[in-house]
């Protein structure tokens, strides 16, 4: 978790002098509770936006927006703590809006936004906005949270972001798999424009079951430049096991930008349809 272009962070708006600060996610008001605390944020909204760094890279960011409730506690609002927790790693990053002037009611509802948390493809985050100071131990909570899932690199808008392109999102191998006679599969896919090797991982399963009955790995050496964007054809020999008929073919590239961690593409061949067995015809017809 990180912030995009930290020096450009702004939270001031007409009628409010405000500064964005790094936060330890442990506000002072936890340790030194105040008697009077503000109410919780209203109408927390999170969207996926895209932002360029000064180097021209494009990153997905969480756009966080919320409004203030129109009650008197606005007079005791000193700021807000924004927290983003990545759920699979428990990594947390916080920033603090510090209000340098007192808020006053005005004709429009106060609205705040922040779009600088860089998020990763296919990750889920808990996004929390805490009004400050935080409540006393038995006080009503004054925060709002939402769990936000970022689309993966298959998503059309994500595909062109720097992290997705680095993991090979622009490569479309257009895999085709056909079953040949004599227990063989022909796998065909389009090579990318990089001199790097590939690996084909074949996993076979029985019909309607999810434990594998055959596994095989096939190495494809790095293509020469004249072979870039050409089709590569590989014939794989299957184990002659009755009922081991559903095959998943996965192609793993080893591009320089992502090495062992590139996006994999896969295709599946289903078991052949079994024809309905007709009722056996008796060879004699009983008379009674």
């Amino acid at each position: 978790l990180r912030l995009l272009d930290h020096r450009a962070l702004v939270c001031s708006q007409p009628g409010l002098n405000c500064t964005v600060k790094n936060s330890t996610c442990l506000d002072d008001s936890w340790i030194h509770p105040r008697n009077l605390t503000p109410s919780s944020p209203k109408d927390l909204q999170i969207q996926l936006h895209f932002a360029h760094t000064q180097q021209g890279d494009l990153f997905p960011v969480a756009h966080i927006e919320w409004t203030l409730q129109t009650d008197a506690s606005i007079l005791y609002l000193e700021g807000a703590e924004l927290s983003v927790l990545q759920l699979n790693t428990n990594e947390r990053l916080c920033v603090r809006f510090e209000f340098l002037s007192k808020l006053r009611h005005h004709h429009r509802r106060w609205r705040f936004t922040f779009s600088h948390f860089v998020v990763d493809p296919d990750q889920e985050y808990e996004v929390t906005v805490h009004h400050l100071p935080k409540p006393i131990p038995d006080g009503d909570p004054n925060h709002q949270s939402k769990n936000f899932l970022v689309p993966d690199c298959e998503h059309a808008r994500m595909k062109v972001t720097t992290p997705c392109m680095s993991s090979g999102s622009l490569w479309d191998p257009n895999i085709t798999v056909e079953t040949l006679e004599a227990h063989q599969l022909r796998v065909s896919f389009t090579l990318w424009n990089e001199s790097t090797h590939y690996q084909i991982l074949l996993t076979s399963f029985p019909h309607m079951e999810n434990h594998s009955c055959f596994e095989h790995m096939h190495h494809i050496p790095a293509p020469r430049p004249e072979e870039f964007h050409q089709r590569s054809n590989v014939t794989l020999t299957l184990r002659n096991l009755k009922g081991c008929c559903r095959h998943q073919v996965q192609i793993q590239p080893f591009f320089s930008s992502c090495l062992n961690d590139c996006l994999r593409h896969s295709a599946t061949v289903s078991c052949p349809e079994m024809p309905d067995t007709p009722e056996p015809i008796p060879d004699y017809m009983p008379l009674w």
């Epitope: 909204q45 999170i46 969207q47 996926l48 889920e124 936000f148 899932l149 689309p151 059309a156």
Partner: nanobody, 126 residues
């Protein structure tokens, strides 16, 4: 312009099933999370279910969990709601709605739903 058209509502007996459909047009359907929201007679709006852009994540309101199934077919620009074991309290106008921004929030919407259908009426009565 964005259009969402629901269909499949009707009068059904308690315990029976219905399948609602929503045909979408005017936007890139497979970019966005989609939702079903309902409004019972004389009540406010209630979020029913949501589905992420690629069907990878799905959420349901507690009141319909285990009975309703949301799905989508991006090739057909369509959203569906399979409703089983219907109860009288499921009687409502059912709306299909599009998430305003990209991304998906479990257990509800990430923010505003910026486009809505006209609704399809589901009446559960014996």
């Amino acid at each position: 312009q964005v259009q969402l058209v629901e269909s499949g509502g009707g009068l059904v007996q308690p315990g029976r099933s219905l399948r609602l459909s929503c045909a979408a047009s005017g936007f890139t359907f497979d970019d966005y999370a989609m939702h079903w929201v309902r409004q019972a007679p004389g009540k406010g709006l209630e979020w029913v279910s949501g589905i992420s852009w690629n069907s990878g994540s799905i959420g349901y309101a507690d009141s319909v969990k285990g009975r309703f199934t949301i799905s989508r077919d991006n090739a057909k620009n369509s959203l569906y709601l399979q409703m089983n074991s219907l109860r009288a309290e499921d009687t409502a106008l059912y709306y299909c709605a599009k998430e305003k921004g990209l991304g998906y929030c479990s257990g509800g919407t990430c923010g505003d739903l910026d486009n809505w259908g006209q609704g399809t009426l589901v009446t559960v009565s014996s």
